[in-house]
């Protein structure tokens, strides 16, 4: 009786068990009792990454300026072209097909982690003692000045957009504060 | 150093069952196909079964089929032969061995192999 | 099934002798031949893969020809720890068989 399985580098076909073809290469023809698989090196801007019996080779993915994208790995005969993206801007999902513009941290709030190529901005608000008062992509909530490191008293508190407003000692307040 | 240790062997009555185990270290044991082996008394070798490295594929000699099993533990980097309704025929040493595929990338020569044999564990069936 | 046939069953020869094993197939397997030696006691040693490649480590004097049903294994020039049984085994398809070995024994 016909064989019914293969080993792992082989596949079944007209009885026999035939040679896949290697990563970078497609089949041409399959193999017969007398003769081995024929394979052939895909082309230009092809590729193959898996042993294999596919009869065309597939196109290296186009990393598409216009869609904000860039070649971060030139791909090979065996791998992919791995897209990323410009400059200030991160990939929508894992294959990266799009890219959008990282956000930005609204006042309030500041940058807690960086975008990446392929992650967006990640912001916390501000805490107490903390704020932020720009928009921004790169910007951490800064602390409060510390009025009283410049022997200065606060005359407005801070909040978690704005910062405290230092201003001089009431000197008669101080004077009799201290008598 | 790379090593296949076989056990379990013994002295069973035909009708009876007996599970092989076959050790394997030195290597990634869970990236390579295996098979078993086995060698009657003065007798040549004969191929009885083999596994894929997932353990999803298996096949079997016609002289072994529906009485033997085998799997794998690719987490304890074991090889099992499960043997049951053994009869006399069966007597022999059982070798585990790994299957290696032997690539050369220029494309010439793209081949399977046996590497890596155990010593052999001896099964009896006799009454 | 695939029958592998191999010739003669023993030899008979002496240290420094040139000696040919051949293996035939049933049917067509290529280049997928495997030659194993074994000595008594002990299990198979891969010896050649693919026909006629040889395995890492063993010596040059052993050699493997062959496509299609017709292979051989040559020894140019026999040394004592060659004296052992010597089998074919096809990895073309499954079952996967051996030839019933052949005896070298020394003069």
């Known amino acids: 009786e016909p064989p019914t399985a293969c080993r792992e580098k082989q596949y079944l076909i007209n009885s026999q068990c035939c040679s896949l073809c290697q990563p970078g290469q497609k089949l041409v023809s399959d193999c017969t009792e007398f003769t081995e698989t024929e394979c052939l090196p895909c082309g230009e801007s092809e590729f193959l990454d898996t042993w294999n019996r596919e009869t065309h080779c597939h196109q290296h993915k186009y990393c598409d300026p216009n869609l904000g994208l860039r070649v971060q790995q030139k791909g090979t005969s065996e791998t992919d072209t791995i897209c990323t993206c410009e400059e200030g801007w991160h990939c929508t999902s894992e294959a990266c097909e799009s890219c959008v513009l990282h956000r930005s941290c609204s006042p309030g709030f500041g940058v807690k982690q960086i975008a990446t190529g392929v992650s967006d901005t990640i912001c916390e608000p501000c805490p107490v003692g903390f704020f932020s008062n720009v928009s921004s992509a790169f910007e951490k909530c800064h602390p409060w000045t510390s009025c009283e490191t410049k022997d200065l008293v606060v005359q407005q508190a801070g909040t978690n957009k704005t910062d405290v407003v230092c201003g001089p000692q009431d000197r008669l307040r101080h004077h009799h504060h201290h008598h | 150093e790379v090593q296949l240790l076989e056990s379990g062997g013994g002295l069973v009555r035909p009708g009876g069952s007996l599970r092989l185990s076959c050790a394997a270290s030195?290597?990634?044991?869970?990236?390579?196909?295996m098979n078993w082996v086995r060698q009657a008394p003065g007798k040549g070798l004969e191929w009885v079964s083999y596994?894929?490295?997932?353990?999803?594929?298996?096949d079997y000699a016609d002289s072994v089929k529906g009485r033997f099993t085998v799997s794998r533990d690719n987490s304890k980097n074991l090889l099992y032969l499960q043997m049951n309704s053994l009869r006399a025929e069966d007597t022999a040493v059982y070798y585990c061995?790994?299957?290696?595929?032997?690539?050369?990338?220029?494309?010439?020569?793209?081949?399977?192999?046996?590497?890596?044999w155990g010593q052999g564990t001896m099964v009896t069936v006799s009454s | 099934d695939i029958q592998l046939t191999q010739s003669p069953s023993s030899l008979t020869a002496s240290v420094g002798d040139r000696v040919t094993i051949t293996c035939r197939s049933s049917?067509?397997?290529?280049?997928?031949l495997a030659w194993y030696q074994q000595k008594p006691g002990k299990p198979p040693k891969l010896l050649i893969y693919?026909?006629?490649s040889l395995e890492g480590g063993v010596p040059s004097r052993f050699s493997g020809s062959g496509s299609g049903t017709d292979f051989t294994l040559t020894i140019s020039s026999l040394q004592p720890e060659d004296f052992a049984t010597y089998y074919c085994?096809?990895?073309?398809?499954?079952?996967?068989?051996f030839g019933q070995g052949t005896k070298l024994e020394i003069k």
């Open positions: 061995a790994r299957d290696v595929f032997f690539f050369d990338s220029s494309g010439d020569n793209h081949a399977y192999g046996m590497d890596v």
């Open positions: 030195g290597f990634t044991f869970g990236s390579y196909e």
């Open positions: 596994i894929s490295s997932s353990g999803e594929t298996t």
């Open positions: 049917q067509g397997i290529r280049s997928s």
């Open positions: 693919g026909a006629s």
């Open positions: 085994q096809q990895l073309n398809s499954f079952p996967s068989t």
